[in-house]
Interface confidence: medium
């Protein structure tokens, strides 16, 4: 049993490997990693990485077996198979491994980026979307602004990110956020560095995007004018005699 | 392991207010969401709300939306359930439930008798 | 909100027959955000089943759960004198809502 051999896919499927409370929890929780075989097994085994000698062993008759990890600390953290046997399979003969289960042991989740799309300078009546973006899928995203006590907005997303839509009227202000994983026990990012949203200031000397925009349709204007008037002078200069308009 | 801890037995006017406190000790408070829920006499149970203290964060049904206030004090350890305009429906034991195990809840405070009469 | 309809309302079955209790849900639940309690008089609820099928600390091996998306099952391999109870099922996604629940009597 010390050196697994594993045969191809279609012979052992692979099992299904879980993790409850949670795949990120805080130090001294209690996790147990639950191996589902997709039929009976005899043992079951735990495997890290690299490592031919299973982590743990489980000899159970039946389709789950779950190993106990106590009081986890950050360097339990890692990734994690699976792989069960019968009685009936050769010596050393496991099945395909299950995926890989990432844990993660930490006080706290690395500090998200904060970020605003298209950017951080808003124009009246327009609309800014704030972007938080972490580095673990399935987390849940809580935006504040600075001088409200509750949270401004909260999202759970499948994504290393979630966005928040602030309409452009009350989008001025200072922001931040974090994320957290979605069910207890909770485990924290640090908050974001803050993100000052400002309005487009419309009376400096430099012109903004909606004034060089009108600036060039007036100029748009004026050459199709000047075009017209041109071409109106030139085509009554030619007419023949006893034509005109 | 954790253990919640409840205030005593109410009697209520009908119109006034109650604050139930749940107590808890053996674990780490914060990083949990203390829910509430409540079981009318001889009646099923229903869930109000919750909060993530170290959050700040609560989640209210929609039934008891605008009613219902639930409150956390990280220093003691101790979440709060207000809830005003009484009617005597509200007439229930009052629980307070902490979800160790995804978001079953794995424990429970003894529950809280709330009397709504006039 | 998802509604949960548990049946039968009331079992009556004798000590060591099989119990089975049902709970429909009104649209698909994650199984991981399924289970079930049991309450007797006076006594807070105890948490059996938690993710459809997963049992609780110290729940004995005669309680088992199962199901899917909108079915899911509580089993009681060998009632004893002390699962004489009422049952609930819970959903416990972003708002947690309760069956209305089963009685287990002694026939």
């Known amino acids: 049993d010390i050196t697994p051999s594993v045969p191809p896919a279609s012979y052992h499927p692979k099992p299904w490997l879980g993790a409850q409370p949670a795949t990120v929890v805080t130090p001294g929780v209690n996790v147990t990693l639950r191996c589902r075989a997709p039929q009976p097994a005899w043992r079951f085994g735990l495997f890290k990485p690299g490592e031919i000698a299973p982590l743990l062993f489980r000899d159970v008759s039946s389709e789950l077996a779950e190993f106990f990890l106590e009081e986890v600390t950050p360097a339990q953290g890692g990734s994690y198979r699976c792989c069960y046997r019968r009685p009936d399979w050769g010596p050393g003969v496991w099945s395909q491994p299950s995926d890989v289960l990432e844990l993660l042991v930490t006080e706290e989740l690395p500090r998200p980026s904060l970020v605003a799309l298209p950017g951080p300078v808003v124009g009246p009546g327009a609309n800014v979307s704030l972007r938080c973006a972490g580095r673990l899928r399935n987390m849940s995203f809580v935006l504040y602004r600075e001088g409200v006590a509750a949270p401004l907005q909260y999202r759970h997303s499948a994504q290393p990110w979630a966005d928040f839509t602030l309409l452009g009227a009350r989008a001025p202000g200072t922001y931040s956020c974090y994320y957290h994983t979605p069910s207890a026990p909770y485990v924290l990012s640090q908050r974001s560095e803050v993100l000052v949203i400002s309005w487009e200031d419309s009376g400096s000397s430099d012109y903004t995007r909606g004034n060089l925009v009108r600036l060039g349709l007036a100029g748009l204007v004026l050459i199709s004018l000047g075009a017209l008037v041109t071409f109106d002078w030139r085509s009554q200069n030619r007419a023949p005699a006893g034509i005109r308009p | 392991q954790v253990q919640l801890v409840q205030s005593g037995a109410e009697v209520k006017k009908p119109g006034s207010s109650v604050k139930v406190s749940c107590k808890a000790s053996g674990g780490t408070f914060s990083s949990y969401a203390i829910s509430w829920v409540r079981q009318a006499p001889g009646q099923g149970l229903e869930w109000m709300g919750k909060i993530i203290p170290i959050l700040g964060i609560t989640n209210y049904a929609q039934k008891f939306q605008g009613r219902v206030t639930i409150t956390a004090d990280k220093s003691t350890s101790t979440a709060y359930m207000e809830l005003s305009s009484l009617r005597s429906e509200d007439t229930a034991v009052y629980y307070c439930?902490?979800?160790?195990?995804?978001?079953?809840?794995?424990?429970w405070g003894q529950g809280t008798m709330v009397t709504v009469s006039s | 909100e998802i509604v949960l309809t548990q049946s039968p309302g009331t079992l009556s079955l004798s000590p060591g027959e099989r119990a089975t209790l049902s709970c429909r849900a009104s649209?698909?639940?994650?199984?991981?955000?399924l289970a079930w309690y049991q309450q007797k008089p006076g006594q807070a609820p105890r948490l059996l089943i938690y993710?459809?099928?997963s049992r609780a600390t110290g729940i004995p091996d005669r309680f088992s759960g199962s199901g899917s998306g909108t079915d899911f099952t509580l089993t009681i391999s060998r009632l004893e004198p002390e699962d004489f109870a009422v049952y609930y099922c819970?959903?416990?996604?972003?708002?947690?809502?309760f069956g209305p629940g089963t009685k287990v009597d002694i026939k």
């Open positions: 993710g459809a099928s």
């Open positions: 819970q959903q416990y996604g972003s708002s947690p809502t």
């Open positions: 439930a902490n979800p160790l195990t995804f978001d079953a809840f794995d424990i």
């Open positions: 649209q698909s639940v994650s199984s991981s955000y």
